[in-house]
């Protein structure tokens, strides 16, 4: 008779989620030279660990420290670049922009993009049927507590300028309930951070209204401030050519405003 | 080789501050954590916090904090330990040591903070 | 905090004897566990890390096991050379913490 297994209302385990792991843990250390002192195998330990035999919708940023502590390293605090719900605008920007960081450019956000992992309480293994959903079953669930942990460590990291890319097609640019909105910007430290600065990202060809009059960009500003910490904004109208700009910086037409 | 080595021992009075430093050969000095642990007379081991010298990262032993500053200056690849409002039962020997694996895989030499009036 | 329990806290032993010291996690600390060894007036130094990995230059009589809660070290053969205090350590959860130190002495 096969046991009973908790039906989650989220997908499962992403599949081949220890090799994927590993696999990109060796990647990124032989990419990085900085990072080549790391050990691989540790590294998928202590991911393991932090949410293996652990009921999956009871699971404490404490159970990723020995992860967080081991996948610790050096990124030029004043680049890094945070995002919200635009996240492949902001990695194409890092990847030709190669002095600046998302999260996603570390070593643990590197690890865990785009997959999905949960275990079960009481046994070894790996969930691939079903993980908890953040909004239908519980917040504290494997993924969603390592994001937050990582988040909030990268967010305290950041020091003088902290670029922000928004998604300007949404109709909340800036979402008090996202990650960027309910983790990081309140973990941005004062005595480090000068200024964020906002991108906000048009998505149609003739947008040429400014979003950084939208109530939502107004209300990040209210939080920022508060947090004495100075706030820009700046209309991102056509990112094609953003992009563009920021690969071949001396291109005539990138004198204008993008 | 990897070498820790930490400053001379300090003779304190009660209510002033130590400042113990570390300097790192033998190894990239921001790759790593750099732990503090001191040792009472006689007694066992207590970690007091560490840091990451590349990002800055610290933690803290509970006990300790608001006492303990830990910093470090990757130029010179040096961390430090700073102690405050000193009291007797501070008499210890203070190690700082390389982390590896979570746990320590290099120690310094030990420095003897004596606080006495 | 996370205690850590070892034992014993002395025991006597000859020079070829096998010697065993015990250390008990108050929780699952999974593999994060390091003993050492200190001799008096010196500083610890590193035996096993990762409940039992053989840190560099450490002889092989010296064998670390365990996960979890419960965790060995093993002196195959003790050496003259041996006698010292051996401590573990946790380093799952901060603050990191040390068993009270098991003393090897000479019977």
């Known amino acids: 008779v096969p046991r009973w297994r908790q039906q989650w209302s989220g997908p499962g385990t992403t599949k081949r989620f220890p090799e994927t792991v590993l696999a990109r843990c060796v990647k990124y250390t032989e990419i990085h030279p900085e990072m080549r002192h790391v050990d691989c195998q540790s590294v998928w330990d202590a991911f393991k660990g932090a949410f293996i035999s652990k009921h999956p919708c009871n699971i404490t940023e404490e159970d990723y420290q020995p992860l967080m502590k081991l996948g610790t390293q050096t990124v030029p605090c004043n680049k890094i670049l945070l995002w919200s719900r635009i996240k492949d605008l902001a990695h194409q920007f890092t990847q030709v922009q190669r002095d600046m960081f998302t999260l996603e450019d570390t070593l643990l956000g590197y690890l865990a993009d785009d997959l999905t992992w949960c275990g079960e309480f009481n046994t070894s293994k790996i969930n691939y049927q079903s993980c908890p959903d953040w909004r239908k079953d519980c917040s504290n669930n494997p993924v969603s507590v390592f994001w937050k942990t990582v988040s909030r460590r990268f967010a305290e990291a950041a020091c003088d300028v902290v670029h922000v890319m928004l998604n300007g097609s949404r109709s909340k640019i800036f979402d008090k309930n996202s990650t960027f909105g309910s983790v990081e910007v309140h973990n941005l430290q004062p005595e480090k951070v000068q200024t964020l600065e906002a991108w906000v990202i048009h998505g149609g060809r003739e947008d040429s209204r400014d979003l950084c009059q939208d109530p939502t960009i107004k209300e990040l500003e209210s939080i920022i401030s508060k947090r004495n910490i100075q706030f820009s904004c700046k209309n991102i109208y056509r990112p094609d050519k953003f992009l563009q700009c920021v690969k071949n910086p001396e291109d005539s037409s990138c004198t204008s405003e993008i | 080789q990897v070498q820790l080595v930490q400053s001379g021992a300090e003779v304190k009075k009660p209510g002033s501050s130590v400042k113990v430093s570390c300097k790192a050969s033998?190894?990239?000095?921001?790759?790593?954590?750099i732990e503090w642990v001191r040792q009472a007379p006689g007694q066992g081991l207590e970690w007091m916090g560490d840091?990451?010298?590349?990002?800055?990262?610290?933690d803290y032993n509970e006990k300790f904090k608001g006492r303990v500053t830990i910093t470090a200056d990757e130029s010179t690849s040096t961390a430090y330990m700073e102690l405050s409002s000193l009291r007797s039962e501070d008499t210890a020997v203070y190690y700082c040591?390389?982390?590896?694996?979570?746990?320590?895989?290099?120690w310094g030499q030990g420095t003897l903070v004596t606080v006495s009036s | 905090d996370i205690q850590m329990t070892q034992s014993p806290s002395s025991l006597s032993a000859s020079v070829g004897d096998r010697v065993t010291i015990t250390c008990e996690a108050s929780?699952?600390?999974?593999?994060?566990l390091g003993w050492y060894q200190q001799k008096p007036g010196k500083a610890p130094k590193l035996l096993i890390y990762?409940?039992?990995n053989l840190h560099t230059g450490v002889p092989s009589r010296f064998s670390g096991s365990g996960s979890g809660t419960d965790f060995t070290l093993t002196i195959s053969s003790l050496q003259p050379e041996d006698f010292a205090t051996y401590y573990c350590?946790?380093?799952?959860?901060?603050?990191?913490?040390f068993g009270q130190g098991t003393k090897v002495e000479i019977k």
């Open positions: 040591a390389r982390g590896r694996d979570l746990a320590m895989d290099y």
């Open positions: 033998g190894y990239t000095f921001t790759n790593h954590w």
């Open positions: 840091i990451f010298p590349g990002g800055g990262y610290t």
């Open positions: 929780q699952n600390i999974n593999v994060w």
């Open positions: 990762k409940a039992s």
């Open positions: 350590q946790q380093g799952q959860s901060y603050p990191y913490t």
